[in-house]
């Protein structure tokens, strides 16, 4: 339950919970927007983005997109809602204490995307092939 | 009623490291409903926050004073610590434990009295 | 990170006068700004967080506006007891910042 301090202290309407009845707080997440970057063939990259904004909504999570073209490399850092596809695609990762990369299909360029629900996660981003596995006893060591 | 209290050394020499503590009574700091942290006032000044956290998210710092501060926590007996390494004059302040719902974090409804720390030599 | 500024500095009114204190940010806060009161000596209280919601046990007389960048908090009728120090407080970047300060003292 809601310690009465609380309920006195907010509006109801800022109150949301999860599926299991759980108060989901406001995330902080990096969020700059898209910005050139020099992220290229690591396995591991920071974000170099030196806004951390609170997320509007308290089931807003963080996001990064990260895009190879002919002429440039982006990195856009931002927070969004889970239940809403971005860049049309579903964040299927968003319960994630980390941002983990994943390939999606775009003509024209490479483009990865990551989502992750801890505060500032999408400031590391991570392409390491040692994350993105269906190993669940992998799976297992990363999320502990 | 959830209440704050600081306590630490009121002196602290240049170049030393000040140690304070924040003790929390009338509930507790795992309770994720509340976040929690230091602000600090120098004499005549204004507010710097100098870093936050909730039980179950990673500490926040202040980039300015990141290298230099570190907030712990010690659930058992319901407090946290801040240690702020290489202190010079411009450190001298009142330091606060705020807290505040996790639900509008960054706000804070209840305030310490505040400890004066001075750095002098 | 976001500077925000106070004006005026100090504002001098009498009790039962309307006094008006002006946040303005360096970048859009949305609506995530908060107002405090300072005696001396003593804590900062919350008065208004989210630009325009008081707090609890906050009087009537004590109302807060704006969105974006420039805000305001509005006493309707000065008591005796509001003469203190008012601070601004923005929750939208962090670290989050606060103004200068304006003072309210008695004309």
């Known amino acids: 339950t809601i310690p009465p301090h609380v309920q006195k202290s907010v509006n109801n309407d800022m109150i949301v919970t999860d599926n299991n009845g759980a108060v989901k707080f406001p995330q902080l997440c990096k969020f700059c927007d898209v910005r050139f970057s020099t992220c290229d063939n690591q396995k591991s990259c920071m974000s170099n983005c030196s806004i951390t904004s609170i997320c509007e909504k308290p089931q807003e999570v963080c996001v990064a997109v990260w895009r190879k073209n002919d002429e440039n490399i982006t990195l856009e850092t931002v927070c969004h809602d889970p239940k809403l596809p971005y860049h049309d695609f579903i964040l299927e990762d968003a319960a994630s204490p980390k941002c983990i990369m994943k390939e999606k299909k775009k003509p024209g360029e490479t483009f990865f995307m990551c989502s992750c629900s801890s505060d500032e996660c999408n400031d590391n981003i991570i392409f390491s092939e040692e994350y993105n596995t269906s190993n669940p006893d992998l799976l297992l060591v990363i999320f502990q | 009623q959830l209440q704050v209290q600081e306590s630490g050394p009121g002196l602290v020499k240049p170049s030393e490291t000040l140690s304070l503590t924040c003790t929390v009574s009338?509930?507790?700091?795992?309770?994720?409903?509340?976040?929690w942290g230091w602000i600090r006032q120098p004499p005549g000044k204004g507010l710097e926050w100098i870093g936050s956290f909730y039980y179950g998210e990673k500490t926040y710092y202040n980039p300015s004073l990141k290298s230099r501060a570190t907030i712990s926590i010690d659930t058992s007996k319901s407090q946290f610590s801040l240690k702020l390494s290489s202190v010079t004059a411009a450190d001298t302040a009142v330091y606060y434990c705020p807290r505040g719902p996790t639900v509008i974090r960054g706000v804070i409804d209840s305030w310490g009295q505040g400890t004066l720390v001075t750095v002098s030599s | 990170e976001i500077v925000l500024t106070q004006s005026p500095a100090t504002l001098s009114l009498s009790p039962g006068e309307r006094a008006t204190l002006s946040c303005r940010a360096s970048?859009?806060?949305?609506?995530?700004l908060a107002w405090y009161q300072q005696k001396p000596g003593q804590a900062p209280r919350l008065l208004i967080y989210?630009?325009?919601n008081r707090a609890t046990g906050i009087p009537a007389r004590f109302s807060g506006s704006g969105s974006g960048t420039d805000f305001t908090l509005t006493i309707s009728s000065l008591e005796p007891e509001d003469f203190a120090v008012y601070y601004c407080q923005q929750r939208s970047n962090w670290p989050p910042t606060f103004g200068q300060g304006t003072k309210v003292e008695i004309k």
């Open positions: 009338g509930g507790s700091i795992s309770n994720s409903y509340f976040s």
């Open positions: 970048q859009s806060v949305r609506s995530y």
């Open positions: 989210d630009a325009s």
